[in-house]
Interface confidence: low
């Protein structure tokens, strides 16, 4: 492969906002590969060398009046000046997520097991995920993945609840997100749909057949005991 | 107080590669970057475009003084070369995996430098390049880089991919692997032995009782037709 | 052909209940999210509910929520609306809808006349 | 939620004119999420316009879409006789998804 050398400059210059743009700080950065050597802080107001390397910058800069002032006026012509032209689509950006709940692995019922709420698509990244059973929070067993950012300005996460679903429980993933007016909340049952008409089926019919029988025996007995003493001797049907 | 938002411009210069960005970040997801062979400005989401404007010539300017540092740089720094940090490579999907839904797969190349990295897709080990995409080197607080790329696929059970990741910093090609994991329904032991006994049962009680229904019938009409002595 | 076709409505007394079913054919029911949009008469329109394509996911309008259930069976390719507690305020045509992208409908049904009133 | 405001309530126009219909959040809308629909009496809506500029499938190009963040436009750039209905605008950015009033479009 390629095994020359390589050289790297990076320059970031970073605008940070704090309520809105009532506080703004602004960084003006460079580095030599990933070693910061000199900035401009707007709280301290001139260049500063990070590293002895950026030592003739930080002086060479911090020389030029006008570019001193140029820097300090960039929290409003440059860092309030950017957020008021993205506002719109950054700052307030929403975008509502997807909510999934399914087991992490298919057991049966009374087995341990992972419930997962997979929360999909959501846009800004601030959201609050709970789990519940039976109405109750569930604060002990609960495993996330954080928050994974997809890249395409959404972002996911998943929330594990570590539990041993028993019959008839109901577990709830409840989902707060600044996109939502309130809670959005996605039930699981801890009895599959097939499970349950399996065991719908098998009482229903017992019932039934016992039903019959009981039905059956009755008519049969009944009618024995009430003809007996009028039955003609030496006669069987 | 944690600042609630944060916009960075940031920009790189790589020699001997002569490989320049150009990009603007909020909260970590790229507002857009600056083609520089089309010098012009790529945004991240089409609707941006809607939105806002950048003169991509700006940053073509911006990229020719990053050059002239990093030449003063290499000079001061008595020619020291980077030191290469290999990527963390996750493959993970867009959306719970359904078959036959469509999804994305996704690709996160992670804290690397230099900002060098050759990415391939490869389905059943050959490589794929339908529909793909990716984004530009994205910065990171401790000033290495990330990157994404992604597949647009069909999940199926007969298909395995894997993201194949080449950068200075690794001794071979890094591949991280992704297939579907199909769920094996429960087995619901006790679900159908209840429904098989009750069943069985049911049906049993239902002949039977139906016999007994029947003979009791029959023997009250017979005693009713034979009437008392 | 691409079609979805709602049934179900009726006159219901208040405190009653309805379940509207929405029957889709010519495309890939699963695929896609669905929504319920209804219409009071000489009014505009409401969207009331709405479901992602593999019924993972459900949505619902803050004057319904806790009353209605959407759900989908995507085996039968139809989607249901299962409404209780029924109000004079419910009375409308409701259409079922197939969500484009994130939920904006594309198609439509013809409507289902639900009529609340004692 | 969001409160989507259509103005005019109604639109008095002669065949051939053209239409302007104006839609204003009372918050910013992401433009990917805003969309247009067409009904005519006894009808089910039609989608015109989704991603606020985006024409649908077999919506004629005399109907385009407009705006971003709060303010949205639908025009019809030259007024056929089918054309006069009700047009509602929708978001579907934030949940509640939410409609405008609609703006009648009559002939005048």
């Known amino acids: 492969g390629d095994t020359r050398p390589r050289f790297l400059e990076q320059v970031k210059h970073e605008c940070h906002f704090f309520n809105g743009t009532e506080r703004v700080r602004f960084l003006d950065r460079y580095f030599y590969h990933q070693e910061e050597y000199v900035r401009f802080d707007s709280d301290v107001g001139e260049y500063r060398a990070v590293t002895e390397l950026g030592r003739p910058d930080a002086e060479y800069w911090n020389s030029q009046k006008d570019l001193l002032e140029q820097k300090r006026a960039a929290v409003d012509t440059y860092c309030r000046h950017n957020y008021g032209v993205g506002e719109s689509f950054t700052v307030q950006r929403r975008v509502y997520p997807e909510v999934t709940v399914y087991p992490a692995k298919t057991q049966p019922l009374q087995h341990h097991n992972l419930l997962v709420c997979s929360v999909n698509g959501f846009y800004p990244g601030s959201i609050e995920v709970r789990w519940f059973r039976n109405g109750q929070e569930e604060k002990t067993g609960v495993v996330s993945t954080g928050l994974i950012q997809n890249g395409d300005w959404t972002f996911q996460t998943l929330v594990m609840l570590e539990t041993v679903p028993r019959s008839g429980e109901v577990y709830t993933c409840q989902v707060e997100h600044p996109s939502l007016t309130s809670p959005l909340t996605v039930e699981w049952r801890a009895r599959s749909e097939s499970a349950q008409s399996k065991m719908l089926s098998g009482v229903g019919g017992f019932v039934l057949g016992l039903l019959f029988l009981g039905a059956g025996l009755f008519i049969y007995f009944r009618n024995q005991k009430g003809h007996s003493g009028l039955q003609p001797t030496g006669f069987l049907s | 107080i944690k600042e609630e938002h944060v916009i960075i411009q940031a920009e790189f210069y790589l020699n001997p590669d002569q490989s320049g960005e150009f990009m603007f970040d909020f909260d970590g997801d790229e507002i857009f970057h600056v083609d520089m062979a089309k010098k012009e400005t790529v945004w991240r989401l089409e609707e941006f475009g809607r939105f806002a404007s950048f003169e991509a010539q700006g940053a073509l300017a911006n990229i020719a003084v990053d050059k002239a540092n990093l030449e003063i740089m290499t000079k001061r720094s008595n020619y020291t070369p980077i030191t290469n940090v290999p990527p963390e490579v996750t493959v993970l999907t867009n959306s719970p995996v359904e078959l036959r839904e469509p999804n994305v797969l996704i690709c996160f190349i992670d804290k690397f430098t230099p900002p060098v990295v050759n990415v391939t897709w490869l389905r059943n080990g050959k490589p794929v390049t339908t529909g793909v995409s990716e984004t530009v080197f994205l910065p990171r607080e401790d000033h290495l880089f990330r990157k994404f790329h992604y597949l647009p696929f069909l999940p199926s059970t007969e298909d395995v991919y894997d993201c194949r990741v080449e950068h200075w910093g690794l001794d071979e090609p890094l591949l991280k692997h992704w297939e579907f994991d199909a769920p094996s329904p429960l087995p619901e032991t006790t679900e159908n032995v209840v429904c098989a006994l009750g069943l069985t049962v049911g049906l049993v009680g239902i002949i039977i009782g139906t016999i007994f229904i029947i003979k009791g019938v029959r023997k009250s009409n017979a005693a009713e037709r034979r009437g008392p002595l | 052909q691409v079609q979805l076709v709602e049934s179900g409505g009726g006159l219901v007394q208040p405190g009653g209940s309805l379940r509207l079913s929405c029957a889709a054919s010519?495309?890939?029911?699963?695929?896609?999210?669905m929504s319920w949009v209804r219409q009071a008469p000489g009014k505009g329109l409401e969207w009331v509910s709405a479901?992602?394509?593999?019924?993972?996911?459900?949505y619902y309008a803050d004057s319904v929520k806790g009353r209605f259930t959407i759900s989908r069976d995507n085996s039968k390719n139809t989607l249901y609306l299962q409404m209780n507690s029924l109000r004079a305020e419910d009375t409308a045509v409701y259409y079922c809808?197939?969500?484009?992208?994130?939920?904006?409908?594309?198609?439509w049904g013809q409507g289902t006349l639900v009529t609340v009133s004692s | 939620d969001i409160v989507l405001t259509q103005s005019p309530a109604t639109l008095s126009l002669s065949p051939g004119e053209r239409a302007t219909l104006s839609c204003r959040a009372s918050?910013?809308?992401?433009?990917?999420?805003l969309a247009w629909y067409q009904q005519k009496p006894g009808q089910a809506p039609r989608l015109l316009i989704y991603?606020?500029?985006s024409r649908a499938t077999g919506v004629p190009a005399r109907f385009s879409g407009s705006g971003s963040g709060t303010d949205f436009t639908l025009t019809i750039s030259s007024l056929e006789p089918e054309d006069f209905a009700v047009y509602y605008c929708?978001?579907?950015?934030?949940?509640?998804?939410?409609f405008g009033q609609g703006t009648k479009v009559e002939i005048k």
């Open positions: 809808a197939r969500g484009y992208g994130r939920y904006s409908p594309d198609l």
């Open positions: 010519g495309f890939t029911f699963s695929s896609y999210a």
């Open positions: 479901i992602s394509g593999s019924g993972g996911s459900t």
């Open positions: 918050q910013s809308v992401s433009s990917s999420y």
């Open positions: 991603g606020a500029s």
């Open positions: 929708q978001q579907y950015s934030n949940l509640p998804f939410t």
